[in-house]
């Protein structure tokens, strides 16, 4: 376990071999989750890229947060996708949080502390527990089958995950840098493996 506070993973160039694999102590399927993270890239007006890829053997797109060029954020649960459009692209560090719950299917998507309109996805579904969680690449199969054209070039950090839906107040607290206790992925006690050309550097966001 490593305390990654104030640090970020840096992916300096396009590749299909560089990634970070995150280890999560999940023992049972997820009926809800929240993922929050920071990232910083110049790619958004150039091409799509993977932000967070959670694959199981049953479904390579179990959870996927992806930037789709000319559209915005693509969010997939269990292979089914919804979009959160972004009309104008700026180059700046971004903080996102997204949550989903099986009981209602409701998805929340927050960008820099601001919520997008709630949407619905995969009501009644459960997310598999035996997962390969990858930063920097999009998994087309469990733990692999990467394409350079979908890789992240830039920085990613503060990746935290919970097995429940955070309240708006809790998400606001996280965005403002307040205290929180993630129970699936914890950036302050991170288990991870680096493959390829990935560097750990001080974070560039406040």
């Amino acid at each position: 376990q490593t305390d990654m506070s104030r640090k970020a993973f840096v992916f300096p160039k396009e590749s299909d071999t560089s990634y970070v694999s995150l280890k999560a102590p999940l023992t049972k399927p997820l009926k809800a989750f929240t993922v929050c993270l920071h990232f910083y890239t110049e790619l958004s007006s150039t091409r799509g890229y993977s932000i967070f890829s959670y694959a199981t053997k049953r479904q390579d797109n179990e959870i996927l947060i992806f930037w789709s060029k000319d559209i915005g954020y693509s969010f997939t649960v269990g292979g089914s996708e919804i979009l959160f459009e972004v009309p104008e692209v700026t180059v700046a560090p971004v903080h996102i949080c997204t949550s989903w719950e099986s009981a209602s299917g409701i998805v929340e998507f927050w960008v820099d502390g601001k919520p997008r309109v709630r949407k619905s996805l995969k009501k009644g579904y459960t997310v598999g527990a035996e997962a390969s969680i990858i930063l920097g690449q999009e998994q087309d199969s469990f733990g692999g089958n990467f394409e350079g054209s979908q890789s992240l070039v830039g920085d990613i950090g503060n990746v935290n995950m919970w097995d429940f839906v955070l309240s708006p107040d809790e998400i606001n607290t996280i965005y403002l840098g307040g205290p929180f206790s993630p129970n699936v992925l914890n950036w302050r006690a991170l288990k991870y493996e680096v493959q390829g050309e990935v560097f750990t550097k001080p974070q560039l966001w406040p």
Partner: nanobody, 117 residues
């Protein structure tokens, strides 16, 4: 076995409208989005849009807003695309595909549309 079966070729006059279909089988229809793609002769693929049969969401790429209308029927596991105000520029092969904006794993065989007077 997953299959996407598309309707047959269409020959229509300029200014008319057309509907083409894509019948899905071999999986739960509401589990995946259905995308529609245009391939003009000798040109690269153009993404038209997609429909999410689970929640009813539709998304249209810029060039096809107002040109295409995407619908579906859950009970028959069929997706439809209507194209309006047709011109010769709309002559192409149109494909449906299952998947996401990131990746599409199964494709229909294509429907050829010819717009000619």
């Amino acid at each position: 076995e997953v299959q996407l079966q598309q309707s047959g070729p269409e020959l229509v006059k300029p200014g008319a409208s057309v509907r083409m279909s894509c019948k899905a089988s071999g999986y739960t229809f509401t589990d995946y989005n259905i995308h529609w793609v245009k391939q003009s002769h000798g040109e690269s693929l153009e993404w038209i849009g997609f429909v999410n049969p689970d929640n009813g969401d539709t998304y249209y790429y810029k060039n096809f807003k107002g040109k295409a209308t995407l619908t579906f029927n859950r009970s028959s596991s069929t997706a439809y695309m209507d194209l309006r105000s047709l011109t010769s520029e709309d002559s192409a092969v149109y494909y449906c595909a299952r998947g996401t904006t990131v990746e599409k794993d199964y494709w229909g065989q294509g429907t050829t549309l010819t717009v000619s007077s």
